[in-house]
Interface confidence: low
């Protein structure tokens, strides 16, 4: 779609005559008829296939034609077409004399024609005017012409439609050649693709308008480069959306179960050793003098009845002291100076001599115990409850109150592998899918921390009177081998000098 434009510039008819040679009276009142048609090698009469146009009377005899385009007038003349410009044309321009005001062809005498010119040739679309001048015997016409495209049409033949738009189908203006020029923030062949926020993740983000970064499901952050973990994930992260990969020390589907309670909560008091034994479960190994689940209770060392053979226990700041009855001596009154002749067995116990009468042993009746059958049997004294369970006397029977992680009549069943405290010497237990693993403290190694690697129980020289000290690696204790003339666990008592008793 375009327009053939014809600009009439000057017409010369000095003698004021018609084509027949007859003069116009009083002068030749001149108007023009224009016919634009397809290319003909010899321009012949016939339909004006590309269009026609007529002018009003523009002047008399000789005159210059004023450029009237700015005022909405008819110069240049416009011959619009609604097809692809073929690049060739034929043009017929006739000058006519108008005796009256009626310019219709049928209203004019046939000899009113002043002059007729016909041209043909090639014409490319463009802004530049082609200047031409046609001369006959009596007249001369100067004019120029060009072909330009209609609004929104571009290209060599005005066949390229381009209309600026800013909607769902594109965001562009048109360049002079009809190519698109994208509006800021848009890209793509037809400027339909928004340019997202700089850095917006190529796969995980998108945008519907420029400088935007909308995240696809499962992603978040300004640039959509952070995955969203599973809803409810407490102590975990993700590398792809909806994952929940647990942080160190946490377990469970949502990483909300604590596998390292000892480290996270430090529940054991008074210097006790803490061992993890499953999810939210732990065991405290108390230092001497303390008891309770968390070793929070201070224990009198005499509570364990360390004094044997009826010895009485006295608490001291640095431990305890046994006051032995006649016939006994030693740290725990464990050494006897009595024999069966002294009737040492109480509560109907029967005496059996040992070592050629130098020692004895009591065989106690039911419900009594002790080296001299001096103690009534407490059903809980045999510690029937395993795994730290608490024994409760219930009249003729007993029952066990189990610690977390253990079950069964005697707390002998462990809920998790760690619940039975398999790690020796204060090792930290970790439940694994197919077993357990012990993390050993300094000085111990082995699958269950059972192997001592550096600590020596004899290092503190616990034996007196030049006794020889031996380390018992299996029990983490020492044994004193006394020289002649000394007895006691530390060889602290001279033989033949039994301790004096206050009674």
């Amino acid at each position: 779609s375009g327009v053939f434009q014809l600009q009439l510039q000057e017409f010369i008819n000095e003698r004021g005559v018609l084509a027949s040679g007859r003069p116009c009276e009083p002068g030749c009142r001149t108007f023009f008829r224009v016919c634009l048609k397809h290319f003909q090698a010899v321009v012949s009469p016939g339909p004006c296939t590309f269009g026609t146009v007529s002018t009003p009377v523009l002047g008399t005899n000789s005159f210059a034609v004023r450029d009237d385009s700015s005022g909405g007038g008819r110069n240049p003349l416009q011959l619009p077409f609604n097809f692809t410009w073929p690049g060739t044309f034929s043009l017929i321009i006739e000058a006519w004399h108008a005796p009256g005001d009626d310019l219709r062809p049928e209203a004019l005498p046939p000899d009113a024609l002043i002059s007729k010119i016909a041209i043909q040739g090639s014409l490319a679309v463009g802004q530049n005017w082609l200047l031409d001048e046609q001369t006959s015997t009596l007249t001369r016409l100067r004019y120029s012409y060009r072909v330009i495209c209609s609004d929104n049409y571009y290209g060599d033949n005005c066949s390229r439609l381009c209309k600026k738009r800013n909607d769902h189908f594109g965001h562009y203006v048109c360049q002079p050649d009809g190519n698109l020029s994208c509006l800021p923030g848009w890209t793509g062949e037809y400027c339909q693709q928004p340019i997202c926020l700089s850095g917006c993740h190529e796969q995980n983000g998108y945008c519907s308008k420029p400088a935007e970064c909308l995240c696809r499901p499962g992603w978040q952050g300004r640039l959509c480069n952070e995955c969203i973990p599973h809803n409810g994930c407490r102590h975990g992260t993700c590398s792809t959306p909806w994952q929940c990969t647990c942080d160190e020390g946490w377990g469970g589907l949502f990483c909300d179960q604590d596998l390292n309670y000892c480290t996270h909560h430090s529940p054991c008091k008074n210097g006790a050793t803490c061992s993890n034994s499953g999810q939210r479960s732990y065991t405290c190994t108390c230092r001497p003098g303390y008891t309770g689940v968390d070793c929070e209770l201070e224990l009198s060392e005499c509570d364990s009845n360390p004094c044997r053979n009826g010895g009485s226990c006295k608490d001291q700041e640095d431990g305890y002291h046994c006051l032995c009855p006649p016939g006994y001596y030693g740290l725990h009154c464990e050494h006897s100076t009595l024999s069966c002749a002294d009737s040492p067995c109480f509560n109907g116990g029967s005496c059996r001599e040992r070592n050629q009468g130098a020692n004895y042993a009591c065989e106690c009746p039911p419900n009594f115990t002790g080296s001299n059958c001096e103690k009534k049997v407490d059903r809980c004294t045999s510690n029937p409850c395993a795994n730290g369970g608490q024994c409760l006397n219930r009249g003729p029977s007993r029952m066990c109150r189990c610690r977390p992680g253990f079950t069964g009549t005697y707390c002998e069943l462990h809920v998790s592998d760690c619940a039975r405290n398999p790690c020796a010497h204060g090792g930290t237990c970790h439940d694994l899918e197919n077993g357990l693993m012990c993390t050993c403290p300094a000085g111990f190694s082995g699958r269950r921390c059972e192997v001592r690697t550096s600590i020596d129980a004899c290092a503190s020289s616990p034996c007196f009177n030049r006794a020889t000290c031996y380390t018992d690696l299996s029990t983490d204790t020492f044994v004193c081998n006394c020289p002649y003339g000394f007895v006691g666990s530390r060889c602290e008592f001279p033989v033949g000098l039994p301790p004096s008793f206050p009674w």
């Epitope: 189908f169 793509g188 062949e189 037809y190 339909q192």
Partner: nanobody, 120 residues
Framework: EVQLVESGGGFVQPGGSLRLSCAAS????????IGWFRQAPGKEPEEISC????????YYADSVKGRFTISRDNAKNTVYLQMNSLKPEDTAVYYC?????????????WGQGTQVTVSS
């Protein structure tokens, strides 16, 4: 030479239906998107629908959404526009067009048009 030939236009009463066809030749049909636009006397051309080369993406102008359906038959090199619930304001010359690419963007070639008149 690229050719697009529309057919199926005519006179119909309000509420009626028409099915326009666009027969294409001169190019590899299933490489190109095809669309329809219309022009009523004295009005600007209005793009109404388009279908991508694969047929997987379709667009509709708000004025025809829910009433018009575009489809293509790549075996027959033809695109169809099923027009239901026609209104007087749908009266126009309907043109078939292609941008010459797989996506619905721009117009490169178009046909001569087919007249649709909706009146009682």
């Amino acid at each position: 030479e690229v050719q697009l030939v529309e057919s199926g236009g005519g006179f119909v009463q309000p509420g009626g239906s028409l099915r326009l066809s666009c027969a294409a030749s001169g190019f590899t049909f299933d490489d190109y998107a095809i669309g329809w636009f219309r022009q009523a006397p004295g009005k600007e051309p209005e793009e109404i629908s388009c279908i991508s080369s694969s047929g997987g993406i379709t667009y509709y102008a708000d004025s025809v959404k829910g009433r018009f359906t575009i489809s293509r038959d790549n075996a027959k090199n033809t695109v169809y526009l099923q027009m239901n619930s026609l209104k007087p304001e749908d009266t126009a010359v309907y043109y078939c067009a292609t941008p010459g690419i797989a996506a619905c963007r721009g117009i490169h070639y178009w046909g001569q048009g087919t007249q649709v008149t909706v009146s009682s």
